[in-house]
């Protein structure tokens, strides 16, 4: 009976440790500044790195600038967005600013987009200053599915910060749905 | 073998608990406002309370302004700062202020410190209103590895607002890593 | 002894299902906008949704505009606030405005409120730009015990975006109190 | 090279006015808040005022307050400081200081000249 | 008003010695003391700022320290050309308070 007792220990051990890990998927994808599009109006961030630097995915899908869930459960998104602009840039179109990010949900079943979180401001960025910043953060815990995306879209993407300490977004799974 | 069954579930539940409680360091550590660094240029907040108030602390270390990892994990870290001018307060000398937070990595064996996460915003703060105030909140999911420093940089440290809810920092585990 | 090495595992699973489900309570709550308090000065919030859209709660309760925790433990808190003004909406009392979130704990034993977290901005919206827009992010990681009450206090609730992904707040369960 | 010039330094009598000005070159002048301060004859050094870089702020010790008014051009990159009710006490020779330090903490890093002021009947 | 005591208002000293200047503030300013030199017919120039930071361009024999009340300045290995009037200054509130200065004199 030892001996057994010492089996179902172990191979609860594995079970624990193998169930822990496949039920927290997670990734942590940083702004790739090699792509990002011009002009001022709301577009979707497409180009995102998954594997350099404090970038990270695990058990979740990066594919055609979206973060594919694999498992259903409760997750935990963020998002931070910087944005930013030096005189040496050169001017701005316009001195007033509307400087947003939409973190969005797609299901494929319902081809639908919705915005799950949103956050910025309006800013008034005079040339009075030589150097211009703005950070926007937002988080929220989400029941995602199977198959669903989540991606990301902000407005005045000309103006992002491309440093992978600035402008990233993630998400971790919490737990499972009942 | 009922007997034995029983005495598998209580060492179970025993290992479970254990292993839970072992594997979820956190820590929420609150501004020491008794000694802010004066100076506008980035500095690191070395003191914070770490067990009074919110504060508090369980399976990392804090020492020398640091908080230090001691078990291997992915954390979910996350930073509160917030700035803040009454004209009572003290002396501006510019209305254009760039109020910034840094979340830092040095690793012991390469001495080099790594910026996790930044945020803020430059502002113009003028005469014409008696009061001003800002807050930035940064957050994010990192590997950490034992012996791994966390440490807050900021610009304008004498602008801090020195409540427990207002400026702050903390991380906790979220898993283990593969 | 296979079999009950069997029943075993099979009332682990069980056992480990229902204690993890049991152990994390959580909660996305989104800004009911029927009912939002007039006037520029600090308000609760007491109309959220709990069950429609994002909204939703599980192993913790909401109720007169207070999420109130069922479960002792340590938990992630979170709040999103968006303020917004459009020119057609009228003319503001003020073009200087301060927008603040405050992240209350109010313990039924003891009837007093703290402040766990504080967030936001001043900010002058002036009359040359027809839209403004601002969003306040916070988040942090709080004891909490069975019976206490969480609830956001803001200014100037009038200017709230009344959408589920502008307003909300939320928190879910990370781990037991040793 | 940051360059800051003052004059307007003169020989005034008691209940006088004078207005000194600070020409500021080789910086942005519109980021910088400024500062006068002076050195009395006995070689001690004493603020005397304080404009901010919009000159939105201001700021007096006591010893000044309602007699002396400091202003800025940032257009024309110059500091000015406007003295009336002149004192005996108020012979100095006068600096221009920039400041750095963008929050309470400020300090002078960029100091004139100089100009001379003697109040004397 | 934060009165800056500097003790000596006279110090002398030779070339290659260390010295260290020492200034007292009448209330706790956490580390915001300037240090500023003085040449003869020459204006004051910045050396250290926030008790410790060097300022740009200030050679690194010139260093300070203090926190709270207590400040020093030091020269670690005096030269000819430091001959000149050293003073401290709070820069934690208004109003902006200097030491009476200290003149170095080289002999």
């Known amino acids: 009976i030892r001996a057994e007792k010492a089996m179902v220990d172990g191979s609860w051990l594995d079970l624990a440790k193998r169930s822990k890990l496949e039920a927290q998927p997670f990734a942590h994808l940083t702004i790739n500044a090699t792509d990002i599009p011009s002009g001022s109006h709301k577009v979707s961030l497409s180009s995102w790195y998954h594997d350099r630097g404090w970038a990270k995915i695990s058990n979740m899908t990066f594919s055609n600038g979206k973060l594919i869930v694999n498992q259903d459960g409760f997750y935990y998104l963020y998002a931070n967005i910087c944005f930013r602009h030096h005189e040496t840039s050169g001017d701005l179109a316009t001195e007033y600013l509307q400087l947003m990010v939409y973190v969005t949900k797609t299901s494929i079943k319902i081809p639908s987009s919705h915005t799950l979180m949103k956050g910025g401001s309006t800013k008034y960025w005079s040339g009075n200053s030589e150097f211009h910043f703005y950070s926007i953060n937002v988080g929220g815990f989400f029941k995602l599915r199977s198959g669903e995306e989540i991606s990301i879209e902000v407005s005045n993407p000309s103006l992002l910060d491309p440093d992978q300490d600035a402008t990233y977004f993630g998400a971790f799974k919490v737990r499972d749905i009942d | 073998i009922r007997a034995e069954k029983a005495m598998v579930d209580g060492s179970w539940l025993d290992l479970a608990k254990r292993s839970k409680l072992e594997a979820q360091p956190f820590a929420h550590l609150t501004i020491n406002a008794t000694d802010i660094p004066s100076g506008s240029h980035k500095v690191s907040l070395s003191s914070w309370y770490h067990d009074r108030g919110w504060a508090k602390i369980s399976n990392m270390t804090f020492s020398n302004g640091k908080l230090i990892v001691n078990q291997d994990g992915f954390y979910y870290l996350y930073a509160n700062i917030c700035f803040r001018h009454h004209e009572t307060s003290g002396d501006l000398a510019t209305e254009y202020l760039q109020l910034m937070v840094y979340v830092t990595k040095t690793s012991i064996k390469i001495p080099s410190s790594h910026t996790l996460m930044k945020g803020g915003s430059t502002k113009y703060w003028s005469g014409n209103s008696e009061f001003h105030f800002y807050s930035i909140n940064v957050g994010g999911f990192f590997k950490l590895r034992s012996g791994e420093e966390i440490s807050i940089e900021v610009s304008n440290p004498s602008l801090l607002d020195p409540d427990q809810d207002a400026t702050y920092f903390g991380a906790f585990k979220v898993r283990d890593i593969d | 002894i296979r079999a009950e090495k069997a029943m075993v595992d099979g009332s682990w699973l069980d056992l480990a299902k229902r204690s993890k489900l049991e152990a994390q309570p959580f909660a996305h709550l989104t800004i009911n906008a029927t009912d939002i308090p007039s006037g520029s000065h600090k308000v609760s919030l007491s109309s959220w949704y709990h069950d429609r859209g994002w909204a939703k709660i599980s192993n913790m309760t909401f109720s007169n505009g207070k999420l109130i925790v069922n479960q002792d433990g340590f938990y992630y808190l979170y709040a999103n606030i968006c303020f917004r003004h459009h020119e057609t909406s009228g003319d503001l009392a003020t073009e200087y405005l301060q927008l603040m979130v405050y992240v209350t704990k109010t313990s039924i034993k003891i009837p007093s409120s703290h402040t766990l977290m504080k967030g936001g901005s001043t900010k002058y919206w002036s009359g040359n730009s027809e839209f403004h827009f601002y969003s306040i992010n916070v988040g942090g990681f709080f004891k909490l015990r069975s019976g206490e009450e969480i609830s956001i206090e803001v200014s100037n609730p009038s200017l709230l975006d009344p959408d589920q992904d502008a307003t909300y707040f939320g928190a879910f369960k990370v781990r037991d109190i040793d | 090279e940051v360059q800051l010039v003052e004059s307007g330094g003169d020989l005034v009598k008691p209940g006088g006015s004078l207005k000194l000005s600070c020409a500021a070159s080789g910086f942005t002048f519109s980021r910088y808040g400024m500062s006068w301060v002076r050195q009395t004859p006995d070689k001690r050094l004493e603020w005397v005022a304080t404009i901010s870089s919009g000159g939105s702020y201001i700021y007096y010790p006591d010893s000044v307050k309602g007699r002396f008014t400091i202003s800025r051009d940032n257009a024309k990159n110059t500091l000015y400081l406007q003295m009336s009710s002149l004192k005996s006490e108020d012979t100095a020779m006068y600096y221009c200081?920039?400041?750095?330090?963008?929050?309470?903490?400020?300090?002078?890093?960029?100091w004139g000249t100089g100009t001379t002021v003697t109040v004397s009947s | 008003d934060i009165v800056m005591t500097q003790s000596h208002k006279f110090m002398s000293t030779s070339v290659g010695d260390r010295v260290s200047i020492t200034c007292k503030a009448s209330q706790d300013v956490s580390t915001a003391v300037a240090w500023y030199q003085q040449k003869p017919g020459q204006s004051p120039k910045l050396l250290i700022y926030s008790a410790s930071y060097r300022y740009t361009g200030v050679p690194d024999r010139f260093t300070g320290s203090g926190s709270g009340t207590d400040f020093t300045f030091t020269i670690s290995s005096v030269q000819a050309e430091d001959l000149a009037v050293y003073y401290c200054q709070q820069h934690y509130s208004s109003p902006r308070t200097f030491g009476g200065g200290t003149n170095l004199e080289i002999k």
């Open positions: 200081a920039r400041l750095d330090g963008y929050n309470y903490r400020w300090y002078f890093d960029v």
